[in-house]
């Protein structure tokens, strides 16, 4: 009598995640009576995938009608393949018994699953940095198979070269993850800049996935301060302005100090944006010179984005301006926040 053969013609089968996989198996004889079972893996820890004899295998269907006696085809189709289904599948013939006795196994078919990488997620530094500093951006993508993958970094369309990439795990796995860290040197012009992480994989058919991060989340552009005095007005008032320019983000608090005492505090809001994404702000004070005997030291103090305050001072020379009669008395208040020094911003 001819020896029973269990034939698995394909050594390997590759399937895209979500598709169905067909695993082929034929036997040379239906003798002796007994079931065919499919397992993933070999040895004592093997996993039962399909048993014609019994059990509920909702994702597995026989390719041919197993109830036809002359059917020697015990191929199966597994639906909705995921990376977790990867492995080597064995078609095994048993002889009926208690327990069933394993007679012969096929050589095995390795199922590999082509799984798309997840959309790359780019994350930037936890705290903002200023121009000329180097910041790190991390790009992560998961769940892809096979392991081969290409990752590139771009800043405003220009490819970056200073990055380090790891694909895990190093050994064989059902699916893989990639993590890449790019180092980017910031400039004052980077508020509108963007970094792009681009992932190319065999499953993407030449249409890479991209993840982006805006440098606006990572950069701080500290302001320039300039305090100037406008010419003396006819009513003995001097207009002093504090120009705060080219800063980002908008979060900024400006305090006027008169001889070291807080005169007024303002918060920047709803400022128009410069072309480069930075902001400008001008605040002004009106100083009634005739109300002062001595020179007035005005300080414009700016606290930007939680950083230590930056000061710019200016002295208004009272001696340079002739006093009017009765000018040594306090000037009448003409509005809130006005204590002989009048202010505004714009």
């Amino acid at each position: 009598e001819e020896e029973l053969q269990v034939i698995q013609p394909e050594k390997s089968v590759s399937v895209a995640a979500g598709d169905s996989a067909t695993l082929n198996c034929t036997v040379s004889s239906l003798i002796p009576v007994g079931p065919i079972q499919w397992f993933r893996g070999a040895g004592p820890g093997r996993e039962l995938i399909y048993n014609l004899k019994e059990g509920h295998f909702p994702r597995v269907t026989p390719v041919s009608d197993p109830t036809k006696r002359n059917n020697m085809d015990f191929s199966i189709r597994i639906s909705n393949i995921t990376p977790a289904d990867a492995g080597t599948y064995y078609c095994v013939k048993f002889r009926k018994g208690s327990p069933d006795v394993e007679l012969k196994s096929g050589a095995g078919t390795e199922l590999s699953v082509r799984a798309k990488p997840s959309a790359p997620v780019v994350s930037g530094p936890a705290v903002r940095a200023t121009a000329e500093h180097t910041v790190s951006f991390t790009c992560e993508s998961h769940g892809f198979s096979p392991r081969d993958i290409t990752l590139k970094w771009f800043k405003n369309g220009n490819e970056l070269s200073d990055f380090q990439t790891n694909v895990d795990p190093a050994g064989k796995s059902v699916s893989y993850s990639i993590r890449s860290t790019a180092r980017v040197v910031l400039t004052r012009r980077d508020v509108h800049s963007q970094v792009i992480c681009e992932v190319a994989h065999v499953t993407l058919q030449g249409d890479p996935l991209r993840g982006t991060a805006n440098l606006s989340e990572a950069i701080r552009v500290p302001p320039f301060l300039e305090v100037t005095q406008q010419s003396m007005r006819a009513d003995n008032q001097v207009n002093v302005t504090c120009q705060v320019t080219k800063f980002y983000p908008q979060r900024l608090q400006l305090t006027w100090l008169e001889n070291g005492n807080v005169s007024r505090t303002e918060m920047a809001s709803a400022l128009p944006e410069n072309k480069d994404g930075t902001y400008n702000w001008t605040s002004w004070l009106l100083v009634n010179v005739s109300a002062h005997r001595d020179d007035v030291k005005l300080t414009c103090q700016v606290e930007h984005d939680g950083q230590p305050a930056v000061n710019k001072s200016f002295s208004v020379k009272v001696s340079a301006h002739p006093k009017e009669q009765g000018s040594n008395t306090a000037a009448e208040n003409t509005g809130t926040n006005e204590r002989n020094i009048y202010g505004g911003s714009g």
């Epitope: 003798i31 079931p35 197993p66 006696r69 018994g97 208690s98 069933d100």
Partner: antibody, heavy 118, light 107 residues
């Protein structure tokens, strides 16, 4: 339609012989394990004999040496040659098809009555 | 030979009842157990194979369970046509053997 039709039953004297036939239609008989099962009047079912696809034959102890199971592929038929019949062989004899891979009975004939009596 | 013992031998029940018949093998038969239904003057009908698999065309009110030596047949809601004699059978090894039968009668 898959069908099994038995014939050849009847009245026979103890020690006599009878040949039962089972004509199969709707499937190829040689591709299946085939069986004979009997039921004495008012009693339960008793498996009698089987023939495998390779021609291997099996019998219950009480009929060994007296009964012979065979098949004729050209006629798609199964037979049971019964010799040295005894009164306790009196029964309805059913031809039964065994299932594909585990030999579970799936198709039964309508049966033929064998009466062994003097 | 493997002995098959059914219980009860007879059972009275009403239409709509749920009934369970048990079958015990004298040794481990894996799950190579079948159940048959027979009505008077008729050939047996195959209901269940490998302990729990329904033959095609058999209504789902019939269910089987068990493995090793202890098995059950359950009919979930009896109908008039279900009153018959039920047999279990082991087919793990020759000689195949049947239980003595359980006669299900209308109460």
């Amino acid at each position: 339609e898959v069908q099994l039709v038995e014939s050849g039953g009847g009245l026979v004297q103890p020690g006599g012989s009878l040949r039962l036939s089972c004509a199969a239609s709707g499937f190829t008989l040689s591709s299946y394990d085939m069986h004979w099962v009997r039921q004495a009047p008012g009693k339960g079912l008793e498996w009698v004999s089987a023939i495998g696809t390779a021609g291997d034959t099996y019998y219950t102890g009480s009929v060994k040496g007296r009964f012979t199971i065979s098949r004729e592929n050209a006629k798609n038929s199964l037979y049971l040659q019964m010799n040295s019949l005894r009164a306790d062989d009196t029964a309805v004899y059913y031809c039964v098809r065994g299932g594909v891979w585990d030999d579970a009975f799936d198709i039964w004939g309508q049966g033929t009555m064998v009466t062994v009596s003097s | 030979d493997i002995q098959m013992t059914q219980s009860p031998s007879s059972l009275s029940a009403s239409v709509g009842d749920r009934v369970t018949i048990t079958c015990r093998a004298s040794q481990d038969i894996n799950n190579y157990l079948a159940w048959f239904q027979q009505k008077p003057g008729k050939a047996p009908k195959s209901l269940i194979y490998t302990a729990s698999s329904l033959h095609s065309g058999v209504p789902s009110k019939f269910s089987g369970s068990g493995s090793g030596t202890d098995f059950t047949l359950t009919i979930s809601s009896l109908q008039p046509e279900d009153f018959a004699t039920y047999y279990c059978q082991q087919y793990v090894s020759y000689p195949y053997t049947f239980g003595q039968g359980t006669k299900l009668e209308i109460k």
